[in-house]
Each structure stands twice: as C-alpha cells, then as structure tokens.
Interface confidence: medium
C-alpha cells in the first residue's frame, strides 16, 4: 500500500514508530483509531494524535511523518522524494522509476514542531536510529495551502587527518564515537547555521586517519555543490581550534534521485 | 495520559549513592530518547543528562560525568539515575524528561525541547 | 559552554499587563532555543522551542521571537496563572543550557 495515512493533529499519547520500524514521528495530531499503513508500505503517516489508540506505522515500515502541514496535493520533483510544507515537510511514496513522486497531505493547523522527515534506514543491530538534528525552519501557522519545496541532499566526505581509526569508531556506545558524532553534529550547525540547511544523517567513519561520511540535507535551491563545500572548507580553522579537527580531502557530491540511505548510528532526540 | 512517575529520592550521606526511577506510562517509551534534569533548592534548572531510545547513546554534564550512569529498561518503561559518590552540590530536585523528537539528523541531544516532566524527586546529600 | 542572561531577573505586572522577557546568549544559538514555565512546587512546562514555535496547548497570548543571540518571550495578557519562574534554554551548543530564570510576579 503507498497511499498515506491522515491524521488530524494536537498532543499525545503514543506518537512513535512501533519498535524496529525505521519511521520517526510527526508531532501534535487530533484523531484517528488506527491508519498505519499495510506492512512494507512507505506511506507517509502523521503523528502526535490526540485520540488515537495507535497510530504508528506497523512494523518494517519506513514511513517517515508529516508535520504541521496545511494542506497540499499533487505531484513533486526534485533531488529526492521529500517535500517540504510551510517549513515542515513531508516524504513522499518513493518511486525508483520517476523523480516526480504522486503526495497527498492531511489538511490540519497546528502549533506543533516543523521537522524534516528522515531517511535513515538501519544497517546492523547496533545502528537502528532514525538520528536528529533540527532543521532551521520554523512554523508557519497560515491554514492557506503553500508550494511545496524539494529538498536537495549532498554526500560529504572527508579526513580527519589528525586522529586515527580503530575499533571504537566501529562501535556506536563507545565514548570516543560518541563524542566523535556529537562533535561532528555541532560542527555542521555552526557551519551551515544560515538559510536553508535541515540537518544531516547517516554518520559514518571509516579507516584511514578517520573518514568521515555523511549526508546533508538542504532546502532546494538554496545551496549547491560547489557552496557546500566552499562554506566547508572555510570552517576548517575553526574546526581545528574549536573540536582540534584537522580536516583535509573533502568532497561533495549531489545524492542521486532516489535517495536510499544507509543509516549510521546517530539517536534521535 | 502520558506521564512519568518518579521515586527513589532520599537523603544520604557524601560519598554514597543513590538511584532514581522516572516509570514511564501513557506513549511509546522505547521510542524516545530521556533526559534527567535538575534544580538546586532556590536555583535554576541545570542539564545532567540524556540516554538515546536505545539506550546506546549517553552523554553527561561535565558536573556529574564519571560519577552518574543514566540507563533504561525498555521492557519496563522505566529511566534510571544511578548518582554515586554524591556530593552535597548534588542535592536538588531531579526530573525526568521526554524529549520531543526531532527527526533528520544525528545525535540525540539536538531536541526540539523537553515536552513530558516527571513531578521530581528529592536527592539530599548531608552528612 | 553558552552562558544564558535572563532579564529582567523578577518582572512585578498586574493581570491583563503585556510582559516581555528577554534572554540574551553569549554567542549565537541561531534559533534553537526553547522557553519553559515552572510554578512553585511543580516541574516545568514547554512553552516554546525552536525560538518561536508554540508547543502542543499552549495558549497564544505567549509567543516567542528573536534569532542568534537575543530572544523575547511575550505574554500579551497576563492570566492569573501566568506568574511563574520562565526559563529559557538553548541546543545550538555542547551542552544544553539554561538561563537563570526570570520571576514574573503579581503587581
């Protein structure tokens, strides 16, 4: 099944994915007894419902939320499947086959959190997060129906030419890979704090001093390749006096459509 | 309702140690990521720390890193503070928190805010 | 760490008084900073994150402003049950912070 589940919106009381499913949640919805999507559906469902027994995607699902939407239907093209909505957005049902993918978005207003819907995916037992970082939109309380954005993704990589790999950097509850992550996270905050970034996932290291991967996710049309790694590269004093991080061999690259990620071991918030 | 229930608050002596229970009732406990909070008597709220939904990821403040283990068991909905060697600027009121989710990105404590509060309980450090 | 300046530290307004509460953070936070309420004897309360999005029933007579390093919290209409500690607290930075607080009592 791809079509979507609506759901109205406001509070409550279990607004999660179900255990093992790879969907984080939408916040603050009203009604509805019980509208996942069948298992295996990508279907993106809304969140954070007020009279709603359970209204999580079931088990396998990888339906990313909706958030604080007002009200949009029809058709989207772009980098990836996202769109998003009054600065919220909402993913729709992917298709390998075409860049434009059919969406269709519960009508509702609310005042609850505007956020990215997530494309991590697990990769092993010990990395089945569907991690956060906050984009840097805020809600728009308008009840109108607005244009949609796409979203454009970028794959980064670099060296951390200053420390060195080892088995730590492969297990995600080790101190050094988690303060390693969170450093990491906080840098690219500082770096691309201005217009149009939504955030980053899917962290990994790799050997060779450490090499760091990772997918950035920006508004469409707000940055491009060559941007990305321009406002990179001018952070890397500051990344070496602020997180002694001697970065070097940084590359970008747009995310071919559609986007299938690979989950690092980042943890939602 | 969502809600947390706390308990094990209690006086101890410094240099003892004490372990609080936030029960978690009401929303998907395993599902998020649980922050504990604490407020000195007559003071502000200061941060003390947060354990990922699966209990993988957890960071501290710098106050209490080393001595406090945050932990959770999600089979019964339940958070834990174990505080060891406690000091006397360890007494205050703690409360557990539910973050509210943020969804693209990594790293657990970049958080939207802190939407479900336990009451707090009461940790005492006095010889 | 980014250190949190509430002002002013205690606020003496009448019911139906507009209060405005200012925190100022030592360096930029960008918009990641969230407003809480806290009663006596009670935990505290989201009211605001993300610098001005109003959390799940929250009333709109609070609403939040401001970006990088000086923010508003305003209370259009005092309420009887409106006076209250408010903190102010921000994720931009390692580690999460909050400010001092500010009193806001009745006139």
């Known amino acids: 099944s791809t079509a979507p589940p609506a759901h109205g919106v406001t509070s409550a009381p279990d607004t999660r994915p179900a255990p093992g499913s790879t969907a984080p949640p939408a916040h603050g919805v009203t009604s509805a007894p019980d509208t996942r999507p069948a298992p295996g559906s990508t279907a993106p469902p809304a969140h954070g419902v007020t009279s709603a027994p359970d209204n999580r995607p079931a088990l396998g699902s990888t339906a990313p939320p909706v958030h604080n939407v007002t009200s949009a239907s029809g058709s989207a093209s772009g980098s990836a499947s996202t769109l998003v909505h009054n600065g919220t957005s909402a993913r729709a049902t992917t298709t390998p086959a075409s860049k434009s993918t059919p969406f269709s978005i519960p009508s509702h207003h609310s005042d609850t959190p505007t956020t990215l819907a997530s494309h991590s995916t697990k990769t092993d037992a010990s990395s089945t997060h569907h991690s956060s970082v906050p984009p840097l939109t805020s809600s728009n309380h308008s009840t109108s129906p607005q244009l949609s954005t796409g979203v454009s993704f970028f794959f980064l990589s670099f060296h951390i030419s200053n420390l060195q790999f080892n088995s730590s950097l492969e297990d995600p509850s080790t101190d050094y890979y988690q303060e390693l992550q969170r450093d990491i996270s906080e840098m690219f905050l500082q770096i691309y704090k201005q217009g149009g970034f939504l955030g980053l996932s899917n962290i990994k290291f790799r050997p060779g001093s450490v090499v760091v991967q990772l997918t950035l996710a920006f508004r469409e049309g707000t940055i491009n390749v060559h941007d990305v790694e321009t406002q990179f590269n001018q952070y890397k004093t500051e990344a070496a006096s602020r997180y002694n991080l001697t970065i070097s061999d940084v590359s970008v690259s747009d995310v071919p459509f559609p986007f299938s990620a690979q989950s690092g071991a980042g943890v939602p918030g | 309702q969502v809600q947390l229930v706390q308990s094990g608050g209690g006086v101890v002596q410094p240099g003892r140690s004490l372990r609080l229970s936030c029960a978690a009732s009401?929303?998907?406990?395993?599902?998020?990521?649980m922050h504990w909070v604490r407020q000195a008597p007559g003071k502000g709220l200061e941060w003390v720390a947060v354990i990922s939904d699966d209990g993988i990821n957890k960071y501290y403040a710098d106050s209490v890193k080393g001595r406090f283990t945050i932990s959770r068991d999600n089979s019964k909905n339940t958070l834990y503070l174990q505080m060891n060697s406690l000091r006397a600027e360890d007494s205050a009121v703690y409360y557990c928190a539910r973050a509210l989710p943020t969804i693209f990105g990594v790293v657990m404590y970049f958080y939207y805010g802190l939407d479900v509060w336990g009451q707090g309980t009461t940790a005492t450090v006095s010889s | 760490e980014i250190v949190l300046t509430q002002s002013p530290a205690t606020l003496s307004l009448s019911p139906g008084e507009r209060a405005t509460l200012s925190c100022r953070a030592s360096q930029s936070v960008s918009s990641y900073l969230a407003w809480y309420q806290q009663k006596p004897g009670q935990a505290p309360r989201l009211l605001i994150y993300d610098a001005s999005n109003r959390a799940t029933g929250i009333p709109a007579r609070f609403s939040g402003s401001g970006s990088g390093t000086d923010f508003t919290l305003t209370i259009s209409s005092l309420e009887p049950e409106d006076f209250a500690v408010y903190y102010c607290q921000q994720r931009s930075n390692w580690p999460p912070t909050f400010g001092q607080g500010t009193k806001v009592e009745i006139k």
């Open positions: 009401g929303f998907t406990f395993s599902s998020y990521a």
